[in-house]
């Protein structure tokens, strides 16, 4: 569910939302760390209805959710949760 990509692209998010999306309606979360042409961290959420939204990284709900997902992955998977794609 939780992925981190390092890309050489500029910022992907034009607009960010802080509107809560429950875990049950999220298909995938992609994290784009700042750098490589974008000065800010970006979080992209794929919803189960096939729509995509950029989420404000400061939104409390996404921070809590990512923490839960990190804990969940570290306790159930022998490999780290982050997938790194190096360009």
């Amino acid at each position: 569910v939780l992925e981190v990509y390092y890309t050489s692209l500029r910022c992907r998010c034009v607009q960010e939302s802080s509107v809560f999306i429950p875990r049950r309606f999220i298909d995938r979360i992609q994290i784009l760390p700042r750098g490589n042409g974008c000065p800010r961290k970006e979080i992209i959420v794929w919803k189960k209805n096939k729509s995509i939204v950029c989420v404000d990284p400061q939104a409390e709900w996404i921070q809590r959710m990512m923490e839960v997902l990190r804990k969940r992955s570290s306790s159930t998977l022998p490999v780290p949760v982050f997938k790194r794609k190096i360009p």
């Epitope: 809560f20 999306i21 875990r23 049950r24 309606f25 809590r64 969940r72």
Partner: antibody, heavy 123, light 106 residues
């Protein structure tokens, strides 16, 4: 006191359409996502649809996707379910239920339910 | 899709008995499970969410436990008003209800 009152159920032929309504009161309707859940006679509960607080997002299980459409009118405190291409297996009591608080971050499930409206699909 | 296997499907017990119902998820759902009570001709009533969090006004004789895939719902001392059908619900990935447990008077 939270109140949810469903209406619009009835007898419809296979292939027909029906629109259910749910009137909400006793809470700030526009702050909550809402869902429809159904129960076939003598059977268990089955989730049918959910719509976000602002109405921009809707979610469905595969067996109703493309046939059912959930919508809402926050100005009227009303929730709707448009059901098309109805089948015999859609026969059930349909409940509307209050879902998660859209302005929060607590992932809570459906908490308050209406008394339901019966939809019978038969020729 | 996540499947929820609830057992038993029916149960006979007496007032004062301790009753346990289980739900098993087909995959890890963390703690995202709720329990509902439904009486004939009535709407379901939420008793517990997030595995063990009791809804306001629900008596403390109701409790829940578990995590991952295995969950338990317990009524510590059955009261006459507790005879009903109980359903579990997973809300980690969309929604799936268990098949229900009908609790009857012995």
């Amino acid at each position: 006191e939270v109140q949810l009152v469903e209406s619009g159920g009835g007898l419809v032929q296979p292939g027909g359409s029906l629109r259910l309504s749910c009137a909400a009161s006793g809470f700030t309707f526009s702050s909550y996502a809402m869902s429809w859940v159904r129960q076939a006679p003598g059977k268990g509960l089955e989730w049918v649809a959910t719509i976000s607080d602002g109405g921009s997002d809707a979610y469905y299980p595969d067996n109703v996707k493309g046939r059912f459409t959930i919508s809402r009118d926050n100005a009227k405190n009303s929730l709707y379910l448009q059901m098309n291409s109805l089948r015999a297996e859609d026969t059930a009591v349909y409940y509307c239920a209050r879902d998660y608080y859209g302005s929060g971050y607590e992932d809570s499930p459906m908490d308050y339910w209406g008394q339901g409206t019966l939809v019978t699909v038969s020729s | 899709d996540i499947q929820m296997t609830q057992s038993p499907s029916s149960l006979s017990a007496s007032v004062g008995d301790r009753v346990t119902i289980t739900c098993k998820a087909s995959q890890d759902i963390n703690k995202y499970i709720a329990w509902y009570q439904q009486k004939p001709g009535k709407a379901p009533k939420l008793l517990i969410h997030y595995t063990s969090t009791l809804q306001p006004g629900i008596p403390s004789r109701f409790s829940g436990s578990g995590s991952g895939t295995d969950f338990t719902f317990t009524i510590s001392s059955l009261q006459p008003e507790d005879f009903a059908t109980y359903y579990c619900l997973q809300y980690d990935n969309l929604y799936t209800f268990g098949g229900g447990t009908k609790l009857e008077i012995k």
